[in-house]
């Protein structure tokens, strides 16, 4: 299911890097979140629960990430103009059932003021 543009601020710039915010409903207990740049998988994070409600977090394509009860943040550093692109949060929900996939995204504009190492 493609939902189109994120209806929240998806990109937060700081210190020459960007935090890409991927939100999900807090009812969701087990999921996989992928960050796509165009059609390429940049990062992923999978949260599962085992017996006794033990939480497991796994990444096949590791990026610096941060998990809260309703979002995953992926951090990209050393921004340059090549980072400008469409980015998508690809959420696969395992629990609660049924399995659902939803895609939200936006375009990352890179301005000179956001670059990490500007030439003086």
């Amino acid at each position: 299911e493609i939902n189109g543009s994120a209806n929240y601020e998806m990109f937060i710039f700081h210190n020459g890097g960007v935090q890409i915010l991927c939100k999900y409903p807090d009812i969701v207990q087990q999921f996989k979140m992928q960050l796509l740049k165009g059609g390429q998988i940049l990062c992923d994070l999978t949260k599962t629960k085992g017996s006794g409600n033990t939480v497991s977090i796994k990444s096949l394509k590791f990026c610096h990430s941060q998990l809260s009860n309703n979002s995953v943040s992926f951090f990209l550093y050393n921004l340059d103009h090549s980072h400008a692109n469409y980015y998508f949060c690809n959420l696969s929900i395992f629990d609660p059932p049924p399995f659902k996939v939803t895609l939200t995204g936006g375009y990352l504009h890179i301005y000179e003021s956001q670059l990490c190492c500007q030439l003086k």
């Epitope: 807090d26 959420l91 399995f99 659902k100």
Partner: antibody, heavy 125, light 108 residues
């Protein structure tokens, strides 16, 4: 008019098999998660099985390993293959559909808003 | 498994009266509760989803409330066609999807 029409019910001996079908019309079948719910005469509703839009399947403990749910979106059809039938499986079987929509932080569940008229399965012991 | 309990089991009222039906869940299901009406020989009909949202075509006299574990279906002024069996149902903690045992609303 939105319609679900079940068929395939009937009388079968204990240990036998039946295949129930449900034909959908006038709604976007492939956007619905589909379920089978049964009801023994004079009793309450019991959920049996479900299949998601992605083909993921779910079963109640009482039918797991004996029943198989499937869907054919191109034909707007839902199926329930029932085997190793028992007297306790005797009931009216309804097919029904519901929708879940995820948008950002919102998780919307719209309820089982389409139902068939039911088909009767009788298992003779 | 989430167990749903409905009470009363039977409710005897007259047309024009207000009906209050209750459903209690064994654990927190937030607002993911639906109400159904079923008449003899017919399939169930969705009345309320998300605890308080009326389904398409359902008259305004039907309303739902509650969240967490305690839910209520209210029929503000009973019409003759409202006498039936009412079920609550949850589908957030599953499988299995569970239904309550039902409340029979009968004419006094």
């Amino acid at each position: 008019e939105v319609r679900l029409v079940e068929s395939g019910g009937g009388l079968v001996q204990s240990g036998g098999s039946l295949r129930l079908s449900c034909a959908a019309s006038e709604f976007i079948f492939n956007s619905y998660d589909m379920h089978w719910v049964r009801q023994v005469t004079g009793k309450g509703l019991e959920w049996v099985s479900a299949i998601g839009t992605a083909g993921d399947t779910y079963y109640s403990d009482s039918v797991k390993g004996r029943f198989t749910i499937s869907r054919e979106d191109a034909r707007n059809s839902l199926y329930l293959q029932m085997s190793s039938l028992r007297a306790g499986d005797t009931a009216v079987y309804y097919c029904t559909g519901d929708r879940t929509v995820v948008r950002g932080v919102n998780y919307y569940y719209y309820g089982m808003d389409v139902w068939g008229q039911g088909t009767t399965v009788t298992v003779a012991s | 498994e989430v167990v749903l309990t409905q009470f009363p089991a039977t409710l005897s009222l007259s047309p024009g009266e207000r009906a209050t039906l209750s459903c209690r869940a064994s654990q927190n299901i937030r607002s993911y509760l639906a109400w159904f009406q079923q008449k003899p020989g017919q399939a169930p009909r969705l009345l309320i989803y998300g605890a308080s949202n009326r389904a398409t075509g359902i008259p305004a006299r039907f309303s739902g409330s509650g969240s967490g574990t305690d839910f209520t279906l209210t029929i503000s002024s009973l019409e003759p066609e409202d006498f039936a069996v009412y079920y609550c149902q949850q589908r957030i903690s599953w499988p299995p999807i569970t239904f309550g045992p039902g409340t029979r609303l009968e004419i006094k």
